[in-house]
């Protein structure tokens, strides 16, 4: 086979045409990523044959390998083919595109592999980095191939800078499968024990008729072997387990336990691992904080949530005021103590449409025979303020006076505002704050007082105005935690009688 | 910690659909494609295809299409692959697999075996 021109490697211009010309004594035929593009094929009257490929109005995605190979049924060397490589440099194109199935890379042994980023130009300097660093990798870059190498199990991309342009490639995904046909499972009857108690542990493999068991575990390293029983679950086909059983456990078979399993027909091995933990006794511990003061809020449900580890399980109460607490027939209390995994446990209480006699002192208190613990709040009822009155006087002393009483919990706030222009606000003027020290014409006096039965504060607050020289309306608001509520009064000049 | 765990083995007759389901666990399933892949008795890793768990799109090898399809169930963060006319070609250990960025993740593979 001969090709003109000979290459191996080409470098041509954007758009420009160019023609590649492959002859020899048999047909032949040029190939471009598996397929034949069109080509002029003619013999020579001295019997060469020939092929000729036009490439017009190049691009940088003509970038890539040319073969030319003998289109013969006569059963030629099929190894007889020429490799060219062409470069198309374009600035408008990156990296060459990939194939889905270029960029995930699998492999089940350590191998050197190549990451095929490759660009349209061969004088760019390409970098290798994994996607999650900026770190050049130090891996050998062919322009025709890519990045080839010994990859770990990660996923990278290649930069390169084209102009003043940083350009990134698609990620490259590298699986390597540590081969295992074998599927091996560990699971223990509980991985905290006390001392005393006993330790059983099943591994379990699935798919294969014949494999031996291996298990590592504490006892065995002081030379103390236990013989493990194996059967087969006939209920499921393929299912063997080996149990591994330790009556009466010290605090040294603390550790981990290792099932390695090996089948000797494909010289396939697996292993898992467990880790048993063997306390001196049992114990209960609060996990993350709850504050002392909780807070719920007026016919609204709220749950209280106490989170703890604990071994072996516990009973839980819950106490309010000293008093055992139950889930009510009603419906008003629910309780519920959830186990989220082998030791960790949830207790919830639900107040469901809180009343103001569910506040007080609440107390969960989880223990078994080995410990205790137990956790305390007070829960503060909130309920939100309403004005309960508004009223209006005029005493005999000429200043008139406005009254204002309401009540929630916690303790509200009050703001007094007034219009005085009755037209203009509160849409397009802002009402005036009243009642400040500085203010001569109004002065403010408010008294605040528990009620205890009840459970909330009242305010009442009244406001002296000196003199009222036409029609104000006044704005008594009251503001706490959870709501705000405002009534308005219409106050009239002495000299005009309202109507 | 990311994990996958499959189906167990399958005997099929030639011509009989197989299905094996991957269920995710330990990372929010929807974050990573799926890929499936097989590895036959005494041959290399065989790339399938596929799966985004988030849109649910999938895109096979030229050689597997329109026989392979694979689906998932978000709810239970399990991806399915189906093989439609199997022959005793395809007799393999299939696994499924997904990538964190900082390595990757594998089921325990599942053997299927087409035999009559």
């Known amino acids: 086979l001969v090709v003109t021109p000979p290459g191996p490697e080409l470098v041509l211009n954007v758009s420009s045409t160019f023609v590649l010309t492959c002859s020899g004594s048999a047909p032949v035929v040029w190939e471009r990523m598996s397929q034949e593009p069109p080509q002029e094929m003619a013999k020579a009257q001295d019997g060469t044959f020939s092929s000729v490929l036009t490439l017009t109005n190049l691009t940088g995605l003509d970038t890539g390998e040319y073969f030319c190979t003998h289109n013969d049924s006569r059963g030629l060397e099929t190894d007889e083919r020429k490799r060219l490589y062409i470069f198309v440099p374009d600035p408008t194109v990156g990296f060459l595109p990939n194939d889905a199935e270029e960029l995930f890379i699998f492999l089940t042994e350590i191998t050197e592999i190549t990451i095929p980023c490759r660009v349209t130009d061969p004088q760019l300097v390409v970098t290798l980095h994994e996607k999650k660093g900026d770190v050049a990798l130090p891996v050998p870059y062919d322009h025709q191939r890519g990045f080839s190498g010994i990859f770990e199990d990660r996923s990278y991309i290649c930069k390169t800078t084209i102009g003043d342009r940083e350009v990134d490639s698609d990620a490259y995904y590298v699986y390597r499968l540590q081969v295992s046909s074998i599927n091996v499972s560990v699971n223990a009857v509980q991985t905290v024990v006390r001392q005393g108690e006993n330790i059983t542990l099943m591994c379990i493999v699935i798919g294969n008729e014949v494999v031996n068991f291996e298990w590592t575990y504490p006892r065995k390293e002081s030379g103390r072997l236990v013989e493990p029983v194996t059967d087969f679950l006939l209920d499921m086909p393929y299912h063997i387990r080996s149990i591994l059983h330790i009556p009466s456990a010290e605090l040294e078979d603390s550790g981990t336990y290792t099932c390695n399993v090996t089948e000797s027909v494909n010289d396939h091995q697996d292993e898992k691992a467990i880790n048993i933990t063997v306390v001196e006794s049992g114990y209960v511990r609060l996990l993350g904080e709850v504050g002392t003061l909780q807070f719920a809020e007026l016919h609204r449900s709220r749950t209280l949530q106490v989170v703890f580890e604990a071994y072996p399980p516990p009973t839980v109460l819950w106490f309010k005021d000293n008093r055992t607490l139950g889930d009510s027939s009603a419906g008003e209390i629910a309780l519920s103590t959830r186990n989220v995994s082998e030791t960790r446990y949830v207790s919830e209480l639900t107040l469901v449409r809180v009343k103001v006699a569910e506040a007080g002192h609440y107390t969960m208190r989880a223990f078994h025979e080995d410990a205790e613990v137990q956790l305390s709040f007070q829960l503060q009822i909130n309920v939100p303020v309403r004005v309960l009155e508004l009223s209006e006087s005029h005493p005999d002393s000429g200043e008139q006076t406005v009254r204002c009483r309401g009540r929630g919990m916690p303790q509200p706030n009050i703001i007094w505002s007034a219009c005085r222009d009755l037209k203009r606000c509160p849409r397009e003027l802002p009402p005036t704050l009243l009642g400040n020290s500085s203010e001569e014409e109004s002065q403010l006096e408010t008294n605040v007082t528990y009620w205890e039965e009840e459970q909330e504060f009242e305010v009442v607050s009244t406001l002296r105005l000196q003199h009222v020289d036409r029609p104000l309306s006044v704005r008594c608001t009251l503001r706490n935690a959870v709501g705000q509520d405002t009534q308005e009064v219409i106050v009239v000049p002495h000299s005009l009688p309202f109507k | 910690q990311m994990q996958l765990v499959q189906s167990g083995a399958e005997v099929k007759n030639p011509g009989a659909s197989v299905k094996v389901s991957c269920k995710a666990s330990g990372y929010p399933f929807s974050a990573y494609y799926i890929q499936w892949v097989r590895q036959a008795p005494g041959q290399g890793l065989e790339w399938m295809g596929w799966l985004n768990p988030n849109s649910g799109d999938t895109h096979s090898a030229q050689k597997f299409q329109g026989r392979v399809t694979m689906t998932r169930d978000t709810s239970i963060s399990t991806a399915y692959m189906e093989l439609s006319g199997p022959t005793s070609d395809d007799t393999a250990v299939y696994y499924c697999?997904?990538?964190?960025?900082?390595?990757?993740?594998w089921g325990q593979g599942t053997l299927v075996t087409v035999s009559s």
């Open positions: 697999a997904t990538h964190g960025g900082d390595r990757s993740y």
